[in-house]
């Protein structure tokens, strides 16, 4: 991989504290190896949907099926784990939705919900109508697979009825679940038919079965819990951005770079330039100029705006993002047309990122 020479004494290091960025936390979908996974792109009014994995364009293959707003992965493997995104392109704008896929031996997905509506789950029966246990709210039990970040709280619910009122007990991996089986124990709220575990850890992974029974019968329901741990992650850039653009001499143009990073990202916009009529220095490395970088004096660093462009502004523009873990970069080309030619938005070509695993 080539490095580069810098012109005009610019530096690729932050000279001032970087700007703060609000980082989104994507949903997590979990599958076991060998299983199939289907995810629907949760964006409305999408004319065209494109998919990426870890910032790289995702196309159909023998295991990946893309149909409308659905992504299907057949026979999932751990290599399918990563940060996915679907981008809905509309006539006036585009929008991206991120989600994580985690393929592990423990399957699951989801997060906790409040217990604000639990009272109606406790159903009282006419004392004469003897009845075996039954589920009163199956909607709250549909999500069997729960992938939860370590340290979060997990709640499993099995709202039930019956006469006489059934009792509820919990099993972990088919065996009686005792308080001493986990540090900090757990809570059972019989009124809400729920099991609550706070500050989950990897050893909490497994199958949790509620057994609801009275003298007339017994029913059970199993949830699967996966505890997702995290490691520091280098930046990920949205595929297809920045996009190639064209404008006439004197026109304005904007390049956009969308960044996903847990850690503080430092964003730089860099352009290949000429020095003394040469694009390369005596060491054979290209001359590069830092046009903009995130810091106190720069506005939204994810956008590079060029005004009143000249032919000299044509060329390749690189969005380079680094954090303390690593870096990523993607580039786009600006074409500057003579005044008499009408400008047209070029077909958006996905630039190949230089950080493919």
């Amino acid at each position: 991989r080539p490095s580069f020479s810098l012109v005009e004494d610019t530096t690729l290091e932050p000279e001032e504290p970087p700007t703060k960025y609000q980082i989104s936390q994507p949903e997590v979908y979990v599958a076991a190896p060998g299983e199939s996974l289907e995810v629907r792109c949760l964006l409305k009014d999408a004319a065209v949907i494109s998919w990426t994995k870890d910032g790289v364009h995702l196309g159909p293959n023998n295991r990946t099926v893309l149909i409308g707003e659905y992504l299907q992965i057949k026979g999932a493997t751990p290599r399918d784990s990563g940060l996915y995104a679907c981008t809905a392109s509309r006539t006036v704008d585009s929008e991206t939705w991120y989600f994580m896929v985690n393929v592990t031996d423990a399957i699951s997905s989801g997060d906790d919900e409040d217990d604000t509506d639990g009272a109606e789950d406790f159903v009282s029966e006419n004392s004469n109508n003897k009845r075996a246990p039954y589920w009163t709210n199956t909607e709250k039990m549909e999500k069997r697979l729960h992938a939860v970040p370590a340290a979060n709280t997990v709640k499993f619910r099995c709202p039930a009825g019956g006469n006489p009122m059934p009792t509820m007990r919990w099993l972990k991996n088919g065996k009686e679940f005792k308080q001493e089986h986990r540090i900090g124990g757990y809570k059972v709220r019989n009124q809400h038919w729920s099991l609550i575990m706070e500050s989950v850890v990897p050893s909490d992974k497994g199958n949790y079965t509620c057994v609801v029974e009275n003298e007339y019968g017994s029913i059970n329901h199993t949830y699967h819990l996966d505890v997702v741990e995290r490691s520091p992650h280098r930046p990920i850039l949205q595929a297809g951005l920045p996009a190639n653009a064209s404008t006439v001499v004197g026109g304005d143009v904007e390049f956009v770079c969308k960044v996903y990073s847990d850690a503080q990202p430092h964003i730089q916009w860099i352009k290949h330039v000429e020095k003394n009529g040469s694009k390369y220095g005596p060491d054979g490395l290209p001359y590069l100029k830092v046009l903009k970088h995130s810091g106190i004096n720069s506005s939204n660093a994810e956008v590079l705006a060029l005004f009143n462009v000249t032919e000299a502004d044509a060329g390749e523009y690189i969005c380079k993002v680094s954090n303390y873990i690593g870096q990523a970069n993607q580039s786009a080309w600006l074409t500057v047309l003579p005044k008499q030619q009408a400008p047209g938005r070029e077909k958006e070509i996905t630039a190949s990122p230089d950080y493919l695993e």
Epitope: P17, P232, S322, G326
Partner: antibody, heavy 114, light 107 residues
Framework: QAQLVQSGAEVKKPGASVKVSCKAS????????LHWVRQAPGQGLEWMGL????????SYNQKFRGRATLTVDRSTSTAYMELSSLRSEDTAVYYC???????WGQGTLVTVSS | DIQMTQSPSSLSASVGDRVTITCKAS??????VAWYQQKPGKSPKLLIF???YRFTGVPSRFSGSGSGTDFTLTISSLQPEDFATYYC?????????FGQGTKLEIK
């Protein structure tokens, strides 16, 4: 599992240079920064600088700029830290650490003594 | 440079105790703080990154919190193997600076 293995202890005279190596395995070398941190005897941790093996980008702590040089050999997944014009106060354990400071080398003791 | 001021510099506690170590940054570092444990003659070990994310394999008794300039590492119930020196670090901007350390000793 990522692993960083550093070169052995060194004894140097004041004014000399030392070059410490850090061999990476178990992960894609070019995808993560490689940091260098030092710790003087009985003291705290001090960040010296980083190199990104994907393109040789470097960032130095101003305190070490001009005296420390960070390089990599991608063919062997090895990073190097060279410190020149050594003085007695450079006596320390020098650590390499992967990008997120999630995996560290075992440390290399550099003793500067006349 | 961003200064990281850790307190206390040393602390005596007993097995089973709840221990809190604090770190104050000289400027806003959002949640870009990590915590490390180091035992004599050993390399530091990452415990917490991005202020509150526990690193893989770190026991749940370790937790991190805070944002902006004030950060906390809590050990909910001290175990014998937890007696060590703890460092905070900001990874917001270069140079990445560490606190001076908190030595946790057996009472």
């Amino acid at each position: 599992q990522a692993q960083l293995v550093q070169s052995g202890a060194e004894v140097k005279k004041p004014g000399a240079s030392v070059k410490v190596s850090c061999k990476a395995s178990g992960y894609t070398f070019t995808n993560y920064n490689l940091h260098w941190v030092r710790q003087a005897p009985g003291q705290g941790l001090e960040w010296m600088g980083l190199i990104y093996p994907g393109n040789d980008d470097t960032s130095y702590n101003q305190k070490f700029r001009g005296r420390a040089t960070l390089t990599v050999d991608r063919s062997t997944s090895t990073a190097y830290m060279e410190l020149s014009s050594l003085r007695s106060e450079d006596t320390a354990v020098y650590y390499c650490a992967r990008g997120g400071f999630d995996y560290w080398g075992q440390g290399t003791l550099v003793t500067v003594s006349s | 440079d961003i200064q990281m001021t850790q307190s206390p510099s040393s602390l005596s506690a007993s097995v089973g105790d709840r221990v809190t170590i604090t770190c104050k940054a000289s400027q806003d570092v959002t949640t870009n703080v990590a915590w490390y444990q180091q035992k004599p003659g050993k390399s530091p070990k990452l415990l917490i990154f991005s202020a509150s994310y526990r690193f893989t394999g770190v026991p749940s008794r370790f937790s991190g919190s805070g944002s902006g300039t004030d950060f906390t590492l809590t050990i909910s119930s001290l175990q014998p193997e937890d007696f060590a020196t703890y460092y905070c670090q900001q990874h917001y901007g270069t140079p990445y600076t560490f606190g001076q350390g908190t030595k946790l000793e057996i009472k």
